[in-house]
């Protein structure tokens, strides 16, 4: 019971997880501006993996795609790589560990294959997290490399063609929503390996078989002095684990001088 | 490179008018608040008027009524009608844009024009 429920729980925080990846992704607040070196103090600039915006008090928004893709920061491509690497891993993740739900029955599927399959997907979302907590981590890194460096020439260069760096974005939305997104995807996965250990078997499970030399099955035959109990040649190469062997009872043992006195 | 470049400066009777501009060109991405600044000799550079992309604008008390900025977001252009000109309107008027790169959308730079002189004399 309890590693259905670690499994299921799981396999819920993941999906939440990857969910908030996906919506970090496609969020545009990655970065927003601080606004405290603007002579028109109503603009609000925020910019995403995929688009840069532009919004204003009077409710006027403007959003430009970055088309080109060979001209963009080596840093955004590899975020934009590390996130959709999270998504595909999770969504796949998600695919299998579907299968190895124990509440979800497939087939004659044993448990051996699920704890392959819950293993799988923990693993999966373990990555999946990782991938989507670097990537922000990354984009963070970026924007703090960037605002540091740009501090120090904010004000200079009043002269014609002087051209002054003006970043002055600090951490949006999206880079908190990435974090925790990731750390329950990261979360899920552990708690989907650790449902796996339960589904294992530990062993292959053997039928308790009573055996034990009584005097009355004890089998005295020619040409030997061999004992009928159980332990001796097995000539049909018998199976006798999970069903195979036979219970006291069934013992079959042969006529002696012993069975008429 | 990014290049701002002025024109439509030059002397103008007392009570008159001129319509200045400012091209930019390179490898924009997006241009933010452009402005209008000026600076009279012996005199610190003051905003004239600025405005956002969504045309919203802001002016200087002096210029409040008498000057209009205006913008062409498609060719990265900004404006400034100067009417009802006066000698205290005399000054080297420096266009001023808010931009991004192509190259690097996530770096936002201030770049200036080179300035184009207005001169209101009779």
């Known amino acids: 019971m309890a590693v259905t429920a670690c499994q299921g729980l799981g396999f819920v925080v993941s999906l939440i997880g990857i969910a908030g990846i996906i919506a970090a992704t496609c969020m545009d607040q990655w970065s927003t501006q601080d606004l405290y070196n603007n002579p028109v103090t109503a603009v609000f600039n925020y910019q995403g993996l995929w688009r840069s915006c532009v919004r204003e008090s009077s409710g006027f928004t403007e959003c430009r795609g970055y088309f080109t893709l060979l001209g963009l920061p080596a840093m955004l491509q590899a975020v934009r790589a590390l996130m959709i690497v999270g998504i595909v891993l999770g969504a796949i993740g998600l695919l299998v560990s579907i299968f190895a739900l124990k509440c979800i029955r497939i087939g004659s599927m044993e448990d051996s294959a699920k704890a392959n399959m819950t293993l799988t997907s923990g693993i999966m979302f373990i990555v999946s997290g990782l991938c989507a907590i670097a990537g922000v981590s990354v984009f963070a890194n970026m924007l703090v490399t960037n605002f540091w460096m740009s501090t120090a020439n904010m004000y200079t260069g009043m002269g014609g063609m002087v051209q002054t760096v003006q970043t002055r974005y600090t951490f949006g939305a999206a880079l908190f929503v990435g974090w925790v997104a990731g750390g329950l995807t990261l979360i899920g996965g552990v708690m989907m390996c650790i449902a796996c250990r339960g589904l294992a078997p530990e062993e292959t499970n053997y039928k308790a078989v009573s055996y034990h030399a009584s005097g009355h099955s004890v089998a005295y035959k020619p040409g030997g002095f061999k004992a009928s109990t159980g332990f001796g040649s097995n000539t049909k190469n018998k199976k006798i684990y999970d069903g195979g062997a036979r219970t006291e009872d069934e013992v079959q043992s042969y006529p002696s001088k012993h069975d008429y006195v | 490179q990014v290049q701002l470049v002025e024109s439509g400066g030059g002397l103008v009777q007392p009570g008159g008018s001129l319509r200045l501009s400012c091209a930019a060109s390179g490898s924009i991405f997006m241009i933010n608040v452009m402005g209008w600044y000026r600076q009279a000799p012996g005199k610190q550079r003051e905003l004239v008027a600025v405005?956002?992309?969504?045309?919203?604008?802001n002016y200087a008390d002096s210029v409040k009524g008498r000057f209009t900025i205006s913008r062409d977001n498609s060719k990265n252009t900004l404006y400034l009608q100067m009417n009802s000109l006066r000698a205290e309107d005399t000054a080297v008027y420096y266009c001023n844009a808010d931009l991004n790169l192509a190259s690097d959308p996530f770096k936002w730079y201030t770049y200036w024009g080179q300035g184009t002189l207005v001169t209101v004399s009779s």
């Open positions: 405005i956002t992309r969504g045309a919203s604008t």
